[in-house]
Every structure is written in structure tokens, then in C-alpha cells.
Amino acid sequence: KEWQCPRTPYAASRDFNVKYMVPSFSAGGLVQTMVTYQGDKNESAVFVAIRNRLHVLGPDLKSVQSLATGPAGDPGCQTCAACGPGPHGPSGDTDTKVLVLEPALPALVSCGSSLQGRCFLHDLDPQGTAVHLAAPACLFSAHHNRPDDCPDCVASPLGTRVTVVEQGQASYFYVASSLDAAVAASFSPRSVSIRRLKADASGFAPGFVALSVLPKHLVSYSIEYVHSFHTGAFVYFLTVQPASVTDAPGALHTRLARLSATEPELGDYRELVLDCRFAPKRRRRGAPEGGQPYPVLRVAHSAPVGAQLATELSIAEGQEVLFGVFVAGKDSGPGVGPNSVVCAFPIDLLDTLIDEGVERCCESPVHPGLRRGLDFFQSPSFCPNPPGLEAPSPNTSCRHFPLLVSSSFSRVDLFNGLLGTVEVTALYVTRLDNVTVAHMGTADGRILQVELARSLNYLLYVSNFSLGDSGQPVQRDVSRLGDHLFFASGDQVFQVPIQGPGCRHFLTCGRCLRAQRFMGCGWCGNMCGRQKECPGSWQQDHCPPKL
């Protein structure tokens, strides 16, 4: 038999201890939230909020401007000063809870934990390729706001998610806030609301639509809003909340809430339970049927998918898919599966399931005993009745009231448990060529860039590297600017190329040349590198013979 070169084991063909230095910015405090802006004339910025300060950075992470956002009551607070002479309420530190772009103007809107959760609008002032913030506008009209009716109280100290939608000549803020009894009593934000920014930026229009956890449930029923996004005709919120109102706090599960992005109304507010599971190829005895549940969403991101993954998910290339990283939760018993799993929920399928759920509730024959649900927001009722009514009223439509869809949407881990002990804390998904890549941050301060594919029994790494020596968790917010992603860990912001930080972690020529084309890797004498790093011969097509 002919002699053959011994095969290099797959794991030996790469080294994830290789150090990569990526550009970073030290923010001077724990990064609380971050967002990027790309203008239409090549101007761009990264906005980074820490306690009492907002940094404006260039795309190279060099500081352009810095603004004091607190403490409230401090004469040096630049945003507070925009609200005129005080006092404006209790003094204290400002933790930025919301940092969003109002793309139509364009402007940056920041909302903090101080000053009743009010927001500030910062017009963007392009200066060449840099962006400066104009003097902030205070989105708060003192004489319009009371503790029980406060259109300008947006952010909750317990956490708020905002998605901005342009409708006609107006911007609507879709706001979701975590509440408890104390927060609800103090210039009460609402759980879910849609607020129109007034054209003169003096605040938000009164009489806005809202849903709130009913006072009797505020103590036990807590909703965490993990992510929000706008795609197509809808705005979506992702929540982690108790599975049952009556057993709250009890076991948690994950829900998707859907709101119309074309009508600022909440009558067609819908919720759907998302179910993510780990189903090992070979099921152990005693393992649950259908796989091990991972009910608690950690992070999420929606993105259009490349051709390969689209085929595996039986959807069209470019369709929008919601990706979520789920964990087992505290009360799930001894874990035999991975720490984190990733599930993919095609948006079109989510919408179809929701629409079918509405039909089941509102079209006869209605299944007896089918509940409208959302008893933490509204009076209990059975379909097709409106909330709180024993029987349908002739002049009210079943469809014009919030509804929890009776079925859940179940998916299994895309990575087949291969993430193992990795605890994923950040996620951003991109499409590169026909490949879909998950860019993940971890609890120990690493970045994993992995191809998303269902059919493999190993992970196809673009990279796996440490952001630094601090080992601090990578935070939930990830932003994109051109070909780079921005991750935050501790007090640092890092700029990570979408195609990976480099190729040096591929140790063999064969492995190097099998890397995805978008990575730009080639063999360079005795190492894997990119063409610009390679003074000598650089080869992308074939390897030199092994002697």
C-alpha cells in the first residue's frame, strides 16, 4: 500500500491562544450602552455611554467629543442644563439606559436613569468625516408631566429597550421598560408604549398608547426586555418573563412581542412563546423528549441569512432570521448539555404562527377554553371575547385587542451543543458571501466568530481570540460600522473586523487555504496571513509539498 502523509488532527491545525491586537478605546468607566452612526456622506461615529458621560468617537475609536450627562443636580451636567434652571428632581448619577439613533433627522437620543427617565436629543453635526453632537435638547416639558401621566418619562432604571420608527413626518419611539412597584409609582414609565416625538423636540406627544403590568402583579411579575428590532411591517420585543402569572416569579420563559410599525396602536399587540432546545444526536436515557429546554434568552440579533444556512432552514436566501442565545435558567436541574445554545427563528414563520393564532382565537369555531392570555396586562378573558368581557360585544372586534398566541415556536440548537462550556453574552450575525457568521462575545472576554451551519459536528471558526487580559464579560450591545463590529467589555470598546482579526491562528497550510474566501487568508512561507502582511510569496491556491 502506498505511503501517505499522516493527517494533522483538526484541533492541531489551529491555535486559539494566538494574540490579536484590535483597536480599542478606554471609556473611563463601565460601558453601559453603545451605538454607531453611518451618514450618507461618509461621516461616521461610535457613541459610547458610561455613568455620567457620553463619548463621541470616530470610526478609528479616537475621541472626538465628550459630554457630561450627570450627576443630575451637578452644575457640570451638560444635558441637565438643557432643561433650564432646576431643580428637576432628586440628584444622583445618570446611568444611560437608552442610546438610539433617530435616523430621520439624524440625531442621537439618550435617556438615563435620573431625572424621571427623561431623554435628550442631540442633533448630529457632521464635520468632514467626523460627527459632533449639537447642544442637547431636553425632551421634557415640566408642566406636561405628572407622576401618573408622564409622556416624557421614558427610561426605567430597571432597563428599557427602544426602537425608533419613521411614520409619515413623525418619529415614533417603541418603548419597552422593566417595572416594579417602586418604579411604576414614580413618574411611571409603561411596560410597552408607542410615543411620538414632537416635531419641535420639546418632548413626546401626550395621550400615547401603552400597556403596563397591572398594579396587583407588579411585585411578582417582572418582565426583562432583552432586545428590540424593526423589520418589515412590525416592531418586535424579546422578553424573559415568568411562564405563569399565578405562579410568578416561578419558572421563566422567553417571548416575542409583535407590534405594528405602520400604525401607532396596540390593539394588534401579539405575544408568542419562543422555545429553544438542545437535542443531542444520541439521546441519553432519561433525557427529555424533544430535547433539553433552554428557556431563558440571553442575547438576540436579527439578520438576513446567506444561501447555505437559508437552504438548511428551508427559507429563501436573504430572508430575515431572529437568532437567540439561550441558557437553561437557574431552576433547570443538573445540566448535562452546553452552557449556551443558539436557535434560529425565521421572521416569516414567526409572523405566520402569530397570524394563525389570531385566527384560532377570532374565527369560528373557536376552540372552547382558549384564553386570550396576557393576564398581567389586561383582564382575563376567553377567545373571542375582548379583555374583561364575558361575551363578545357586537361593536368590538376580537382582533383589536392584545393576544398571547396559544402555540409556541420550537427550535433546536444550531450548534448541536458544540459551544460546550462557553457562556455567550453578546451576539451579532452577518452575511458574508453566501455564508452566515455569528460573532459572539463570551463571559470570559473572548470573541468567537463562527459560521452558522446546522449539519456539521464541529464548529467552523473564523476566529476565537481574547479581547485582552481583563477577562471581563463582553456586553450585550454590539454595533456595526462598515466592515467592523464594535464590542464592549468592562471599560473598553473594541473594533473587530467582520472577516476576523487575522489568519495566524491557522497553523497548517491546508487549514489556512480552507478558510472562507472572505477572510482573505493565504499561505505565506511558513505561516497563514493576509496579503498585506506578507512580504514574500503569498499563496491562496495550493500548498507547498511537505518534505
Epitope: 409619515g168 413623525a170 411620538r196 416635531a199 419641535d200
Partner: antibody, heavy 116, light 107 residues
Framework: EVQLQQSGPELEKPGASVMISCKAS????????MNWVKQSTGKSLEWIGD????????RYNQKFKGKATLTADKSSSTAYMQLKSLTSEDSAVYYC?????????WGQGTLVTVSA | DIQMTQSPASLSASVGETVTITCRAS??????LAWYQQKQGKSPQLLVY???TLAGGVPSRFSGSGSGTQFSLKINSLQPEDFGSYYC?????????FGAGTKLELK
């Protein structure tokens, strides 16, 4: 469909007062400020002021303070503008227009003529 | 108050031509600017808001540009229905002010 229906033309004597109405339909009246704009014959447009029907809060262009008074009736979704101590300078078309980034919705205009 | 200076005051053009109207603000108004068209005896009609966003139903031959203090409205391939008066207006704080107008006439 958003509509703003203004009252008909007015012929007034100098020194008199006039009240113009603007009935809104097709949207939540209290959710948007109502603005008033003046246009003299062959001239440009001038912003008079606005009213927030939810709170009855008003803002005026300094030039029209004391001349115009803005009010709103929530129950009938109608905004009103009273012009007092009329002179020939007040002869113009007056428009109501709904708040927005740019005024997308206008009434048809009310012609006020002041003549002895 | 912010002054809006519009030019030219009047303009003659033929169907099919391209014309540009400019508007200068006396101070930085970022993108808080709208353009209107008004025909004789009619209410003004919103064309552009946020300096460059076309209002619903406005033909794509209209386009707005600029930010800060200098703005322009461009009309490509003039159509018979485009003749009339055009006004710019800022909404960056009160009082809102309009330009003096540009009368676009058929040559």
C-alpha cells in the same frame, strides 16, 4: 384620512374681532399641536403660533401676541383663532395646519377681509 | 429669530428643464427644514421635510439637499404642473419662519 376643515370667509370692520374655526378629523386631535399661519395677498407665509389641545398650552410668534388668541375644544376636535382690533394689515388668508416635521396637512384657508 | 433667505425671488423656465432654488438660514438649523409648493388660491403642499426626505406622493423629480445653513430644492425635468410658488421653512425652535418665496413661471 386626515382633514382640516376651516370656517368660511369673513368681512369685518376695522376695530372688530373675528373668530376662525378649524375642525380636525381622521386623527387623534389631542395628539398633535395645531399651528396657524397667515398669508397676505401676494406675500409669503408667517407663523402665528400653535396650541397643544391636550394641555391647552399655547405659543405665539412675538409679532402676533395680543393680536391672536388660540383655543381648542377637545370634545368637538376643533381649534379656534380669534383676531382682535382688526386693521387692514390683518386682511389675509389664515390657515390651520397640523404639527409635524414640515406641515403635511393644511386647512383650505379662511379669507379675512377688513374694510370700512 | 432665525431668518430664511430664499433665492431667486422669481425664475422663468421651460418644461423639461432642471431648476434649483436655494435657501439660507441665518443660523445652524441642522436638517430641520421643509419645502412647500403653492399654487394660486390653494393651500401650500409639503414637498420635502428633514431637508431631504420626500413627502408621501411627491414625484421623484423633486429632491432636497443641504444641512446646517445652506439648503436647496432641485426639480429635474420640469412638468407643467410644477409652476407656482415655492417656500422653505425651518422648524428648529420657535418662531417657525418661512422664506420669502420663489415664483417659478413658464418661460
Amino acid at each position: 384620512e386626515v382633514q382640516l376643515q376651516q370656517s368660511g370667509p369673513e368681512l369685518e370692520k376695522p376695530g372688530a374681532s373675528v373668530m376662525i374655526s378649524c375642525k380636525a378629523s381622521g386623527y387623534s386631535f389631542t395628539g398633535y399641536n395645531m399651528n396657524w399661519v397667515k398669508q397676505s395677498t401676494g406675500k409669503s407665509l408667517e407663523w402665528i403660533g400653535d396650541i397643544d389641545p391636550y394641555y391647552d398650552g399655547t405659543r405665539y410668534n412675538q409679532k402676533f401676541k395680543g393680536k391672536a388668541t388660540l383655543t381648542a375644544d377637545k370634545s368637538s376636535s376643533t381649534a379656534y383663532m380669534q383676531l382682535k382690533s382688526l386693521t387692514s394689515e390683518d386682511s389675509a388668508v389664515y390657515y390651520c395646519t397640523r404639527e409635524g416635521r414640515g406641515f403635511a396637512y393644511w386647512g383650505q384657508g379662511t379669507l379675512v377681509t377688513v374694510s370700512a | 429669530d432665525i431668518q430664511m433667505t430664499q433665492s431667486p425671488a422669481s425664475l422663468s423656465a421651460s418644461v423639461g428643464e432642471t431648476v434649483t432654488i436655494t435657501c439660507r438660514a441665518s443660523e445652524n438649523i441642522y436638517s430641520y427644514l421643509a419645502w412647500y409648493q403653492q399654487k394660486q388660491g390653494k393651500s401650500p403642499q409639503l414637498l420635502v421635510y428633514n431637508a431631504k426626505t420626500l413627502a408621501g406622493g411627491v414625484p421623484s423629480r423633486f429632491s432636497g439637499s443641504g444641512s446646517g445653513t445652506q439648503f436647496s430644492l432641485k426639480i429635474n425635468s420640469l412638468q407643467p404642473e410644477d409652476f407656482g410658488s415655492y417656500y422653505c421653512q425651518h422648524y428648529y425652535g420657535t418662531p417657525l419662519t418661512f422664506g420669502a418665496g420663489t415664483k417659478l413661471e413658464l418661460k
